[in-house]
Interface confidence: low
């Protein structure tokens, strides 16, 4: 709706939802359906973005804001605003070009979309494999060999307790 | 699914202020602008106005500038109409209404009687 | 302001009748038209905005036509639930104006 015209710009006065008609001396006039203009002064109302084939509707168009879009089971948004769908694939895969293929040994993915990534390398932490990895799940590192000597504990001691009300620096 | 709900009925005396809810739910409360309008008894539906629900600006017709004051509360999703120094044509049925392309869901009206 | 004129005020039809009302405008309002019912005692429900498209959830009976200043509600076949006061709306500019309303009565 049109709110107090400016004698600088009447323009600039138009609300979200409509749009300044030149062809109709400035008026304010309602977006049309199918469309939206979510800022006030614009001089055209924008379509409306259509959520058809992989891509489906998660927020309907209204007359200030756009259709919001995400992806039918099966696929996954990828880019802002949801402006692709990519397939998921399993965990323990990875999308290629030719298709979701299994993860390669010594690599997993615990999620249906991403590439698989390598296990960790607990030696690189001075720890050994507790839990071995598989194409879905990482390994467990865990402590050392030599913190498994006669007397010491496997289990990692808890961190030090805080003082209440203090933030970790 | 959208709902708009307003505050009850109301019997007031001349001169007396009173403040009408209309609670929104089922949507973003600040994604509608929300409109008022007025129907007394026997007669046609008339526009009063509308607030901007994202800025909180309001919008008032001419015939109702002064005494009727559009407000909100976004933390609960409620626009309220505020009516002063009430006079006995004030009484009426007064609905809140969401705009998107029209008004398209109406809250169920509150009954403002005004007598002495 | 802009004056929406509608007529008749009041109609009596019987069931499964062709029924019309119609709303002048005093200018131009574009598509800028909205139609809404409203049942005795009951809150107004948007039927048609933009002259001709009809709001969710309400039965293909119900039709709107018209641009500029003539429009037109029209309901084909009328049932005993249509019984109604009906208004038109112009939502070009402020302020949006109604029109005087028709009421729709069974015979």
């Known amino acids: 709706f049109e709110r107090t015209r400016s004698l600088q710009d009447p323009c600039s006065n138009c609300p979200a939802g409509t749009f300044c008609d030149n062809n109709r001396n400035q008026i304010c006039s309602p977006c049309p359906p199918n469309s939206f203009s979510s800022a006030g002064g614009q001089r055209t109302c924008d379509i409306c973005r259509q959520c058809k084939g992989v891509f489906r509707t998660r927020k309907e168009c209204s007359s200030t804001s756009n259709a919001e879009c995400d992806c039918t089971p099966g696929f996954h948004c990828l880019g802002a605003g949801c402006s692709m769908c990519e397939q998921d694939c399993k965990q323990g895969q990875e999308l290629t070009k030719k298709g979701c293929k299994d993860c390669c040994f010594g690599t997993f993915n615990d999620q249906k979309r991403g590439i698989c990534r390598p296990w960790t390398n607990c030696s690189l932490d001075g720890k050994s494999v507790l839990v071995n990895g598989t194409k879905e799940r990482d390994v467990v590192c865990g402590p050392s060999p030599a913190d498994l000597s006669p007397g010491a504990s496997s289990v990692t001691p808890p961190a030090p307790a805080r003082e209440p009300g203090h933030s970790p620096q | 699914q959208v709902q708009l709900v307003q505050s009850g009925s109301e019997l007031k005396k001349p001169g007396a202020s009173v403040k009408v809810s209309c609670k929104a739910s089922g949507y973003t409360f600040t994604d509608y602008s929300m409109h008022w309008v007025r129907q007394a008894p026997g007669q046609g539906l008339e526009w009063m106005g509308w607030i901007n629900t994202e800025t909180g600006e309001p919008t008032y017709a001419d015939d109702f500038k002064g005494r009727f004051v559009f407000s909100l509360d976004t933390s609960v999703s409620t626009a309220y109409l505020q009516i002063s120094s009430l006079k006995a044509e004030d009484t009426a049925v007064y609905y809140c209404?969401?705009?998107?392309?029209?008004?398209?869901?109406w809250g169920q009206g509150t009954l403002v009687t005004v007598s002495s | 302001d802009i004056q929406m004129t509608q007529s008749p005020s009041s109609l009596s039809a019987s069931v499964g009748d062709r029924v019309t009302i119609t709303c002048k405008a005093s200018?131009?309002?574009?598509?800028?038209v909205a139609w809404y019912q409203q049942k005795p005692g009951k809150v107004p429900k948007l039927l048609i905005y933009w002259a001709s498209i009809r709001h969710t959830g309400v039965p293909s009976r119900f039709s709107g036509s018209g641009s500029g200043t003539d429009f037109t509600l029209t309901i084909s076949s009328l049932q005993p639930e249509d019984v109604a006061t009906y208004y038109c709306q112009q939502r070009y500019t402020t302020p949006p104006t109604f029109g005087g309303g028709t009421k729709v009565e069974i015979k």
């Open positions: 200018q131009d309002v574009s598509s800028a």
């Open positions: 209404a969401r705009y998107d392309y029209a008004m398209d869901y």
